[in-house]
Amino acid sequence: FERTRSLQDPCSNCPAGTFCDNNRNQICSPCPPNSFSSAGGQRTCDICRQCKGVFRTRKECSSTSNAECDCTPGFHCLGAGCSMCEQDCKQGQELTKKGCKDCCFGTFNDQKRGICRPWTNCSLDGKSVLVNGTKERDVVCGPSPADLSPGASSVTPPAPAREPGHSPQ
């Protein structure tokens, strides 16, 4: 059966960039403009992706491969193959359905995308805050308070356990 398969199914001989045209005795016809086939033996060609709106064309469609899109500045890609564009925010902000909003006190975002995350709680590691956090930057933890003053007691009082991520003032 395998030996005669190509005789019984002439479409299997059609290479990528063509389709098996049933209207023309199953001969291999080139994909029409704005369409492609990425594999051989296809009976139709797929419509090329169009990069509209803030989608930009990163790679043009060819007869054997689809177009690829990315997003114009001010937006970034989301999803497989950049299926969506999502707006950027400034550092120190996060995106909500109401648009870009500043990070709440005790949280930060050092990127143009993603959500605000809580500051590191240095006291959980027995350390002290060396540099305070901001909306754009996490706190910098330093040595434990005991390490800073040799004469100090080695017992460090626990930090107040109110809202995690808030740096001591």
Epitope: V54, L78, G79, S83, M84, E86, Q87, T96, K97, I115
Partner: nanobody
Framework: EVQLVESGGGLVQPGGSLRLSCAAS????????MNWVRQAPGKEAEWVAN????????YYVDSVKGRFTISRDNAKNSLFLQMNSLRDEDTAVYYC????????????????WGQGTTVTVSS
């Protein structure tokens, strides 16, 4: 075919008004958040406004609050942007965009876009 087609752009004087429309086809319009996004010449693209599925939630970028109103007519598969008190800085190509399937769930990607309509504010 899933499609969005904007219309209503044009040349208007500062202080004037325009109403943009967006006709949707090929998908269940009433099931999606919808957005307006604009891109001014030589500037980054900017989200302008969005509206939820039934029109009960509407949000705007600060620069257009009190001047622009987003609305929708689900029976006619249409999205609108009423623009009043237009300023020079509102000059841009305005795009209609569909919110992605998980829009509002910590993701705000837009997956279907129109070709845009040009608004020029000039005296």
């Amino acid at each position: 075919e899933v499609q969005l087609v904007e219309s209503g752009g044009g040349l208007v004087q500062p202080g004037g008004s325009l109403r943009l429309s967006c006709a949707a086809s090929g998908f269940t319009f009433r099931s999606y958040w919808m957005n307006w996004v604009r891109q001014a010449p030589g500037k980054e693209a900017e989200w302008v406004a969005n509206i939820n599925q039934d029109g009960s939630e509407k949000y705007y970028v600060d620069s257009v609050k009190g001047r622009f109103t987003i609305s929708r007519d689900n029976a006619k598969n249409s999205l609108f942007l009423q623009m009043n008190s237009l300023r020079d800085e509102d000059t841009a190509v305005y795009y209609c965009a569909r919110g992605g399937p998980d829009y509002g769930d910590l993701h705000y990607g837009m997956d279907v876009w129109g070709q845009g309509t040009t608004v020029t504010v000039s005296s």
